[in-house]
Interface confidence: low
């Protein structure tokens, strides 16, 4: 039974773990006095880490800075000072280290240059930071270099003078392909989308920008939208918020063909002080937040159909503070269809909500077993778990980390939380779910940093404390039992845990510094758990697990979005290595269709607590404002449309008379009168 966690009790204490870990703990002391450290992993499964330390002394007129660059190729066990490879140059930390996609081995560091120089300077490596080439730029970069996802030799950057610069040879040579550019993004197939201002500046022309596209790295251009406020890419959708003709409101328009044709999204328009935000998007659908009028701090989540056009209201009073502000919206990547977020209730308290079906229905998080409701609860026996995420962190609550889940650690979600009627400002505890958020248990008392290793085979945690620490905790049974390991005799001021992205590694690096009266020294301890998980997992170590199972007796048990998935999961009792090549084994099976597998199409809605879609009464005999492609085609519907990503077959097929909606269609989206095609000579 999953109760409160046990630490070093009769909990299957691992034999000789202290000796095994001591032999696999590697200390590295950094011989510099830097004020900040940034760390980047280069490539996947390469073991290469770059560490940039910076030391800045602000003087009256200029600031004097010094950078040091270190490289490890054994997951952080040993580091080599490679500052000489960048000519001891001061690196601008605000640009970070631009690491190339996948395993390209490419790295770009942007250097600080003196005031009068013609352009910026970068150091480029294409061999996992073994060597760097210094390149002087013909412009001063405003943003970090952006790699094309399809070809890491193709780079784009904006200059401080709003020029759009492109390189086709990994930054060796650069060409300015357009001026007056406000925002630029890579799309699919090396397409670049960007907005330009026509009259004054990006800020002054907000709402009067043009959206352009180039498919050939700047040889030719096409204007694909006008009166643009902003644009974004999500999944296979291109979104633009477009100013209305009549007033200062704006509306979202959607394209699924890179801007050749647009449709107006069936979403409320927003005023000047409001905003739209794409919370999440995949190849099937999008979660869109629409801000409420006024400075409320909340809005509404809508989920789209497969075209990104028809939207269903998903969640009211969704917490989202301001444009670019804080939202707790979290995609639980360890289980399909699961998202967690926060709502702001009438009394201004914040409550966590979870959806298991991609936004179809939201509910409170189940109260962890054996937990007591805190002071926020009216009824001491009935309450729920509330998760601390970005908003709590921004409010400086004692929450060192956001919720954590990993696609290859199936079902595991770790988060800080409190148990009551709303999020509490009291010191939180750490909770874990092993089933994607259906059930929860307290994992650790008080705030901790945590990370997942070996695809869930090991969970590592470090207590969040303002005192120096020297203990790391780890669990090999998904957080039920914990062992403590003293990784150093000299406690350090802890600054962060670092493990290779993807949670496949068995190494964890503990970063911090030691401080004496005069000096501060950076230090890292890398602990390798390979000897704790001595053997490779075998077939017997895994057990099948039906995801989303809530009623094993029901033939539709586990059906989410038209199919169920059985996973092979490591038994909690098995202490073995999943290994770096571990692939999540899952067996999907299709479910029969029911009305739950369909959303309501244009002009239809579901009355409260009903499953059938009925025609919207206000549209009977009226014109439809929302139109596909702004034209009169494809406007027939039977009122239902399959939910994006739903794979159900057979069963219930909502058949009814097909209505012709062409007669009701009006769209006022102004596509550019003639979609200009231009050549860049």
């Amino acid at each position: 039974r999953r109760g409160a966690p046990a630490e070093d009790q009769d909990c299957g204490r691992l034999p000789d773990f202290i000796a095994k870990l001591t032999n696999n703990t590697h200390q590295h002391v950094f011989d510099d006095l830097s004020g900040s450290v940034s760390l980047s992993w280069v490539g996947d499964s390469t073991g290469v880490i770059l560490v940039l330390t910076t030391f800045q002394v602000p003087l009256v007129i200029v600031s004097f800075g010094q950078s040091k660059l270190y490289r490890s190729e054994d997951y952080g066990k040993n580091f080599k000072d490679i500052t000489n490879l960048i000519n001891n140059t001061f690196i601008r930390t605000e640009f970070g280290m631009a690491i190339g996609p996948e395993n390209s081995g490419k790295v770009i560091l942007t250097a600080e240059v003196s005031g009068g120089s013609r352009g910026g300077r970068v150091f480029r490596s294409s061999d996992f930071a073994k060597n760097f080439v210094q390149t002087d730029l013909p412009f001063h970069p405003l943003t970090q270099m952006m790699y094309s996802p399809q070809n890491s030799d193709y780079l784009l950057a904006l200059s401080t003078e709003n020029g759009l610069w492109v390189s086709k040879n990994f930054g060796e040579k650069w060409e300015e392909i357009h001026k007056a550019v406000c925002l630029a993004k890579w799309g699919p197939n090396n397409i670049i989308f960007f907005t330009t201002h026509v009259n004054g500046s990006c800020k002054a022309d907000l709402g009067a920008l043009e959206l352009w596209r180039t498919s050939d790295l700047g040889k030719t251009f096409k204007t694909i939208g006008v009166k643009i406020y902003s644009f974004g890419l999500g999944g296979r959708f291109l979104f633009a918020s477009v100013m209305a003709d009549k007033d200062t409101t704006r509306r979202i328009h959607v394209s699924t063909d890179q801007g050749d044709t647009w449709s107006m999204a069936q979403l409320p328009s927003v005023g000047q002080e409001q905003f739209y935000s794409i919370l999440a998007a995949n190849e099937d659908m999008v979660f869109m937040h629409v801000d409420e009028p006024g400075d409320t701090g909340f809005g509404t989540i809508f989920t789209s159909d497969d075209r990104g056009i028809v939207y269903s209201k998903s969640l009211d009073r969704h917490l989202y503070t301001t444009t670019g502000g804080e939202t707790d919206f979290t995609n639980v990547t360890s289980l399909r269809g699961v998202y967690i977020t926060s709502t702001l209730s009438e009394d201004n308290s914040i409550q966590s909500m979870i959806t298991f079906d991609q936004g179809g229905r939201w509910e409170h998080l189940r109260k962890p077993e054996n937990s007591k409701c805190d002071a926020t609860a009216k009824n001491k026996n009935e309450c729920s778990l509330h998760i601390h995420a970005s908003y709590s962190i921004s409010q400086k609550l004692n929450v060192p980390m956001a919720p954590l889940s990993e696609p290859n650690a199936v079902g595991i979600v770790i988060a800080h939380g409190s148990v009551g009627d709303a999020i509490s400002v009291m010191v939180p505890d750490v909770y874990i779910s092993d089933d994607g958020g259906y059930s929860w248990a307290k994992m650790l008392e008080g705030p901790h940093y945590y990370t997942i290793l070996d695809s869930g085979g090991i969970i590592v945690a470090i207590e969040h404390s303002n005192r120096p620490i020297n203990v790391i905790k780890f669990s090999t049974d998904e957080g039920q039992c914990w062992q403590s390991y003293v990784f150093t005799q000299e406690p350090i001021y802890f600054t962060g845990l670092a493990s290779e992205p993807g949670a496949r590694s068995m190494n964890i690096s503990i970063w911090g510094f030691t401080e004496s009266f005069i000096t501060r020294q950076w230090v890292s301890y890398t602990v390798d758990f390979k000897d704790i998980l001595e053997r490779n997992c075998e077939e017997d170590d895994y057990t099948t697990w039906l995801a989303h199972s809530t009623d094993p007796g029901d033939y539709k048990d586990g059906c989410i979005l038209g199919y169920k998935e059985q996973f092979l999961r490591l038994r909690k009792s098995s202490v073995c290595q999943n290994g770096r090549d571990y692939v999540v084994a899952k067996q999907p099976s299709v479910c029969p269709c029911s009305l739950e597998d369909f959303l309501c199409d244009f002009g239809y809605f579901r009355p409260e607590n009903a499953s059938e879609c009925v025609e919207q009464p206000e549209l009977k005999g009226h014109e439809l404002e929302f139109c596909l492609y702004g034209k009169e085609e494809h406007l027939t519907t039977n009122g239902y449309r399959k939910i994006p990503g739903d794979k159900c077959q057979g069963g219930m097929n909502p058949a009814r008379e097909v209505k012709d909606l062409k007669k009701k269609c009006t769209s006022n989206f102004l596509n550019p009168t003639k979609q200009n095609s231009k050549s860049n000579s």
Partner: antibody
């Protein structure tokens, strides 16, 4: 309702093989493992092995390795246990038992702990010359 | 393999008595322990899983406790239908071994 129905009693000569069947009904066959347990006359229970009907993978107790084969037929929701090279000490009642280690139960408390919750009526196998 | 040792191997008790049976594992098995009841000529019946969780339909006079290596099955007030043999079984790692059994007889 959920039930497991086993084949009838068998009398075999030493050295022969026996194949016992266990037909499942009332639940999703591929969602639960199936264990086989035997009980010699006047003795205790002895676990022989387990099969995952979904993929057909098996795990046998060392004692029976090389002599036991567990298979399944998903079209008829039936699992089989075949024991070869029979000797007199194999005389026992053989049980199949549904083993929910292969499924997440509804409540969090039971999600990873489980027992063999449904048993067949048993098949008596007598080995005698 | 993990050895499961049950004690006593048999006991005599009267209706209404409180009965305790213990089971010890040769190594820690966390809470992966089940208890079964078997009556002559019948298949075993699951009583307790996960050391302390009562299987649905089992009377509440049966309870289980323990974790690690030492476990206990308690019948708070023995009823006539409770006279049977009781087995513990570990479900921690294969092979899923059983204890030798405890026969509860009428005094």
């Amino acid at each position: 309702q959920v039930q497991l129905v086993q084949s009838g009693a068998e009398v075999k000569k030493p050295g022969a093989s026996v194949k016992v069947s266990c037909k499942a009904s009332g639940y999703t066959f591929t969602s639960y493992y199936m264990s086989w347990v035997r009980q010699a006359p006047g003795q205790g229970l002895e676990w022989m092995g387990i099969i995952n009907p979904s993929g057909g993978s098996t795990s046998y107790a060392q004692k029976f390795q090389g002599r036991v084969t567990m298979t399944r037929d998903t079209s008829t929701s039936t699992v089989y246990m075949e024991l070869s090279s029979l000797r007199s000490e194999d005389t026992a009642v053989y049980y199949c038992a549904r083993d929910p280690s292969g499924i997440a139960a509804a409540g969090p408390a039971s999600r990873y702990y489980y027992g063999m919750d449904v048993w067949g009526q048993g098949t008596t196998v007598t080995v005698s010359s | 393999d993990i050895q499961m040792t049950q004690s006593p191997s048999s006991l005599s008790a009267s209706v209404g008595d409180r009965v305790t049976i213990t089971c010890r594992a040769s190594q820690s098995i966390s809470s992966y322990l089940n208890w079964y009841q078997q009556k002559p000529g019948k298949a075993p019946k699951l009583l307790i899983y996960g050391a302390s969780s009562l299987q649905s339909g089992v009377p509440s006079r049966f309870s289980g406790s323990g974790s690690g290596t030492d476990f206990t099955l308690t019948i708070s007030s023995l009823q006539p239908e409770d006279f049977a043999t009781y087995y513990c079984q570990q479900h921690y790692v294969g092979p899923f071994t059983f204890g030798g059994g405890t026969k509860v007889e009428i005094k």
